[in-house]
Amino acid sequence: MMTGTIETTGNISAEKGGSIILQCHLSSTTAQVTQVNWEQQDQLLAICNADLGWHISPSFKDRVAPGPGLGLTLQSLTVNDTGEYFCIYHTYPDGTYTGRIFLEVLESSVAEHGARFQIP
């Protein structure tokens, strides 16, 4: 039975040209995290595998940095980066958990972080 929950940074905003950290955290389970995939819509950004380390998609290599932890740092943001991001946790023995983050990239300096929220 899957008892865990994914906590994410929720809805966040950032300035064009700046950077942002995407973070998810798996709680309420003793399952072992074997891999975390980061995806934007249907496009793979990066994978963090417990044994193999990080794989950053070649098309994002210049502006995606691994970490901190299992999170992902997006740099040199453009308005095209606005959208949904997903952290997909592969765990043993539970299976797969998915968290969602919505990022809005703003032209002005009114970017503020949204509140944290949980996805069961």
Partner: antibody, heavy 119, light 107 residues
Framework: QVQLVQSGAEVKKPGASVKVSCKAS????????MYWVRQAPGQGLEWIAF????????TYNQRFRGKATLTVDTSISTAYMELSRLRSDDTAVYYC????????????WGQGTLVTVSS | DIQMTQSPSSLSASVGDRVTITCRPS??????LSWYQQKPGKAPKLLIY???TLPEGVPSRFSGSGSGTDFTLTISSLQPEDFATYYC?????????FGQGTKVEIK
């Protein structure tokens, strides 16, 4: 088009070392990890290690730690694998291969380099 | 280590036949599996990655399916150039491992 050209066949004595090169062209060298795989005569495929030219970080199959050392020269888009303390059972074709866009698979392969270890 | 068991180890088939090769990892690898084709004296060539995705240039007669611990490579209508050895590989942990290969021969 993407191409990986490996150095020529080598014959070495037991205990010696050998350095195999893999020259990449047709893509941005630093964006893709380079993998090394070997195939003993008449046998299957065995992964050795890979290196990320972007940061120089390497990940090894534990079985080849201390045997294989990977390096890159990004200025000439070339990856290298040095094999040390060669034994007769290291006789194999050694392949370099460019990693995939979406994970740890091997998208494009070099033609292979036969390393023969014989006294 | 994740062990990759391919079956059969060899098979004989005729041009036009439908051919199926199975790969069974020793543990759940989700869909992190690729397939390669190797002809004698040549380097392997990627046929499928992530269990079912064909790279550009691979003929559509090749298809992959499966997830977890049961995967299949299918050649819908065998062509003369398809006689070769096929390998599966997981890309989910260290070490990356390959199946022992399936040799497809002419009947």
């Amino acid at each position: 088009q993407v191409q990986l050209v490996q150095s020529g066949a080598e014959v070495k004595k037991p205990g010696a070392s050998v350095k195999v090169s893999c020259k990449a062209s047709g893509y941005a060298f630093s964006r893709y990890s380079m993998y090394w795989v070997r195939q003993a005569p008449g046998q299957g495929l065995e992964w050795i290690a890979f290196i990320d030219p972007y940061n120089g970080g390497s990940t090894y199959n534990q079985r080849f730690r201390g045997k294989a050392t990977l390096t890159v020269d990004t200025s000439i888009s070339t990856a290298y694998m040095e094999l040390s303390r060669l034994r007769s059972d290291d006789t194999a074709v050694y392949y370099c291969a460019r990693g995939g866009d979406y994970g740890w698979y091997l998208g494009v392969w070099g033609q292979g380099t036969l390393v023969t270890v014989s006294s | 280590d994740i062990q990759m068991t391919q079956s059969p180890s060899s098979l004989s088939a005729s041009v036009g036949d439908r051919v199926t090769i199975t790969c069974r990892p020793s543990e759940n690898i989700y869909t992190y599996l690729s397939w390669y084709q190797q002809k004698p004296g040549k380097a392997p060539k990627l046929l499928i990655y992530n269990a079912k995705t064909l790279p550009e240039g691979v003929p559509s007669r090749f298809s992959g399916s499966g997830s977890g611990t049961d995967f299949t490579l299918t050649i819908s209508s065998l062509q003369p150039e398809d006689f070769a050895t096929y390998y599966c590989q997981h890309h989910y942990g260290n070490p990356l491992t390959f199946g022992q290969g399936t040799k497809v021969e002419i009947k």
